[in-house]
Amino acid sequence: YSHWPSCCPSKGYPSEELLRWSTVPVPPLKPASLDFHSVSCRASEDGPLNSRAISPWRYELDRDLNRLPQDLYHARCLCPHCVSLQTGSHMDPRGNSELLYHNQTVFYRRPCHGKKGNHKGYCLERRLYRVSLACVCVRPRVMG
Amino acid sequence: YSHWPSCCPSKGYPSEELLRWSTVPVPPLKPASLDFHSVSCRASEDGPLNSRAISPWRYELDRDLNRLPQDLYHARCLCPHCVSLQTGSHMDPRGNSELLYHNQTVFYRRPCHGKKGNHKGYCLERRLYRVSLACVCVRPRVMG
C-alpha cells in the first residue's frame, strides 16, 4: 500500500492527508447466528449456515475498543469430524471438521506524536489479525 | 463506533486526531491457494483447505486502489452439491455447497474538504462490503 497517501506530509501528495471516520452509521458486523446456546454436534435442517453445515460451528466474540473493527467473531468447530448428510447427527470419521483461517486487516489506535514529540491525538496502525471464519468439512490429508 | 475519536475536532478528545498509515510493511492478504487452473468439482487429499473441502471453492481477486484493503478475495463454489467423502469426486445430492458471506469493514478514500470547501487531501469513509469467504457443505433447508 506504499502508494496510498499518508496523512503525514509526503512528496507528491497534499501536505495534510486527514483520514476521517465517516459519520455514516455502520451497523455492527454480527454473524447471522449468535445463539451460543443449544449448540451441539449436529447439522440442522433449518437456521443459519453455521448450524446447517455438516461441519457446524459457533461464533465467539472478540471485542477490542482500541481496534477497528472493534468486534470480530471467531468460529469454533462443534465437531471433530463431519456429520453424516444422511442423519445429520452421527459423525463420519472419513471427514475432518477444520477451521478456515484468514489474516484480516485491522487498525489499532495509537497515540500520535507531533514534531516535538508531544501527543497529537491518535493515529491508526494497520496490522494483520488472524481470525477463524468457519469450519469446513475436508478429506483428511494423505501423507505421501 | 461512535465512541471512537474522529480526526475532526470533537469534545473530549485532542483537537487533532490524525489517523496515519503505519509504516510497518504489511504483506498482501492472499489466500493460501490462488491456483485458478486445474480447479474442478472434486475434493483433493492434499493441498489447501479450499481444495480438500467436500464443498471445494476457488478464489477470485477483487482489487480496488481506492480501498483498504485494496485486495479482497471472493470464494466461488466449484460444485452445486457436496462431494462424497468416500470417493472425493461423485456428488451427493443430499448436501448443498453454499457460499458463506460476510460483511467486511473496508475504507474508501474520499477527497477531504477544508473549512473553506477546498480540497484538503484524502479522508477515509468506512463501509460494509460483502465478500464470500468459503463454500460450506450444508443439509438443505426443510421447509416447515
Partner: antibody, heavy 120, light 108 residues
Framework: QVTLKESGPGILQPSQTLSLTCSFS??????????VGWIRQPSGKGLEWLAH???????QYNPALQSRLTISKDTSSSQVFLKIASVDIADIATYYC????????????WGQGALVTVSS | QIVLTQSPAIMSAFPGEKVTMSCSAS?????MYWHQQKPGSSPRLLIY???NLASGVPVRFSGSGSGTSYSLTISRMEAEDAATYYC???????????FGGGTKLEIK
Amino acid sequence: QVTLKESGPGILQPSQTLSLTCSFSGFSLSTSGMGVGWIRQPSGKGLEWLAHIWWDDVKQYNPALQSRLTISKDTSSSQVFLKIASVDIADIATYYCARIGPVHHGFPYWGQGALVTVSS
Amino acid sequence: QIVLTQSPAIMSAFPGEKVTMSCSASSSVNYMYWHQQKPGSSPRLLIYDTSNLASGVPVRFSGSGSGTSYSLTISRMEAEDAATYYCQQWTSYPPMYTFGGGTKLEIK
C-alpha cells in the same frame, strides 16, 4: 516523462491472431499499484476496455472477450503484450495501451494508438 | 454489468459559456473519471475520482456527482475545448472498466 507506444501488424486476415506490443517508459511495472491496460476504439465509435495487467502479474479481462484475450508483460524490457485470437471485422479498431494507477483507476497516460485492420 | 449513459450526445456552446454534461450509471458507482478526446488524438484524462483534476488540466474543468449521477462542467468554454468527452468507471468485482458513449462538444 511517461510515454507509451503501441505497435502491431497493421493488417491481418480473419481467424488469425492479433499480437500487439506496448512499449513504455517513465515508470516501472514493478512498482506497487501500477498497471497497464488495453482499450480499443472502432473508427467513429466509443472506447472499449479489453484487459489489463498489474505489477504483481495479476491479469484482468473484459468478460465478453476473455476467451480470446491473453495479456502478458516483460517488466525488464518495459513492455506489455496483448494477443487476440480468431480476429474478424468486428475487431477493426485503433488499439490503445494506457497506464493505470498507482493511486486511482483512471487512465492518466495513453499511447498514440495502433490501427488494426482485418481484411481477407 | 454497469452501463454509462451520457447526455446530451451532441452539444454546442459559445466561447465563455458555461457547459455541463451528464453521465448516468445503471447502478451506483463509487468514482467517475472523465476523458477528453480530440479528432485524431488519444484520449486524455481530465478528472479522476469524481472531482480531482488530473495533472495539467485547466481549472475551468470540474467534476461532481455521486451514486448514479455524475457531471462534468466547463466554467467558461474555450475553442480548444471542442472535443468528445467520455465518462469512465470501474467495478472491482467482477473487474470491469466501462466507458460512456461520449458527448461531442462543438464550439458555436
